[in-house]
Each structure stands twice: as structure tokens, then as C-alpha cells.
Interface confidence: low
Amino acid sequence: MSLLSVPHTESVSLSTGSTVTIEARPLVCFFNEPHLQVDFHTEMKEDSDIAFHFQVYFGNRVVMNSREYRTWKEEVESKNMPFQDGQEFELRILVLEDKYQVMVNGQAYYNFNHRIPVSSVKMVQVWRDISLTKFNVSN
């Protein structure tokens, strides 16, 4: 299976009911503390506002946040860590009416209430210490 380049940036148009699907694998073992970062940007540039920031510190914790007017807001942290060392995973981000729901390998683990309208999201970026095999948006 061919790998997608990382960072992977894609133009998107999201609404309630949209699903972002990512299949990937950590590049290194958890002992070396790899990260995964997924950002839902409001513009097609990396320094734009972020409606949903999802960062996995593999083997440790997950952090979710938003960035508005170049300022990070209140962080939401979870210690739930369903990712397994060295294993491929499927991440699905569901856009619900009131929140983003993040599923790992088919199970819901994380929720993040909307702070910025979903209709503002123009670009999704997936990056950091992963090999990426799939990125898909379904509306």
C-alpha cells in the first residue's frame, strides 16, 4: 500500500454528518514518544485559526483544543490511550451537531464541543510522527 506524504494537507468542506477517516501507524515505538496531530483549519494556510486541534502523545495522553485569533484556548485532555505500540490504527472524526466525536478502531473515545462553526473549516492537516496510508472525507 502506498504511503501519503506527511504533513498531509487537504482542502475540505465539512458539515454535520461529515466523517474524516485517517489510517496510519506510529513511525517509532511509544518509548520514543511519537505524536500525531490533526488540525481543522479555517483557511488554507498553517497559521490560520484551528476549529479542532487533535494531538496524540502516543502512550501518554490526547489533547484537544482550538486556536482563535492566533491564540490557543482551553485545552481538553484525555488519558484514554486506545492506540497500540507499533500497530496501524483507524481514526474517524465524526462531525456531530454539537461536537466532534473521535473514534479509534471503531470505538468512540473522545469528544470535543464545537467552538468555531464547522462551516468555517477549509483545510485539514495530518502530520507529525506517523506513516499515513489513508485520508478520506465523506459528507
Epitope: 511509544f30 518509548f31 502512550g59 501518554n60 488519558k79 484514554n80 490511550m81 486506545p82 492506540f83 497500540q84 473515545y109
Partner: nanobody, 121 residues
């Protein structure tokens, strides 16, 4: 294959402390995340505390500040220290092992049979 056996339960007074032990037999103990859950009569099993294979710890809000979880990989044992016990801590305490650091009973790979803790007022 892991075998999980809890011990240390019993009858204690409110305000007392208790240390539960969880002995695990199996060659790969050190690669498992270890969790404690509890189940009070007539209630669902609830997460209490976790310790990752690398040693990171987490206690549920219901026991935060009163809970210490530790592991001794040389002895293949996990410990749960509970301080300032309350009558509502009365439950069967279960030790579990998982390859995923997830605080959900359905995610556990191996379970012990439990040890009863009764806190009297």
C-alpha cells in the same frame, strides 16, 4: 496468557487506609497496562485507577487525592493504596490487564476474580 489474582481486601473503618495487591503470572506482565476497577452491589463496574507499562499513573475523579497506584515489574505485582476510605468505597475491587491504556471494562484483556473491600462507618 496472564493470570491475575487480587488480595488485601477486608473490613475497615471509615477514614482508614488499605493497600490492595494484584499478583500477575505471565511472561509479558511488564508490557501490559494495569487497571483497578470496582463494583458495588447493584451497580456497574467502574474504573478506579490505572498504571501504564511505562509507569504513568491515573486515578478516577472519585478517588483522586486518596489513591496511589504503583507496580513492581520485578515482582509482577500492582498495588492500589486507598486512603481516607469512605462507606461509598465499599465494593469488590478487580484488577485487570490490557494492551490498550483505556479505562473501559470492555477493553480489558485479562481480569482477576476480585477482592471485597467493606468500609464501615
Amino acid at each position: 496468557e496472564l493470570q491475575v489474582v487480587e488480595s488485601g481486601g477486608g473490613l475497615v473503618q471509615a477514614g482508614d487506609s488499605l493497600r490492595l495487591s494484584c499478583a500477575v503470572s505471565g511472561r509479558t506482565f511488564s508490557s501490559y497496562h494495569m487497571m483497578w476497577f470496582r463494583q458495588a452491589p447493584g451497580k456497574e463496574r467502574e474504573f478506579v485507577a490505572a498504571i501504564a507499562w511505562r509507569g504513568g499513573t491515573y486515578c478516577a475523579n472519585s478517588v483522586k487525592g486518596r489513591c496511589t497506584i504503583s507496580r513492581d515489574n520485578a515482582k509482577d505485582t500492582v498495588y492500589l493504596q486507598m486512603n481516607s476510605l469512605k462507606p461509598e468505597d465499599t465494593a469488590v475491587y478487580f484488577c485487570a490487564a490490557s494492551l490498550r491504556y483505556v479505562f473501559d471494562p470492555s477493553a480489558m484483556d485479562y481480569w482477576g476474580k476480585g477482592t471485597l473491600v467493606t468500609v464501615s462507618s
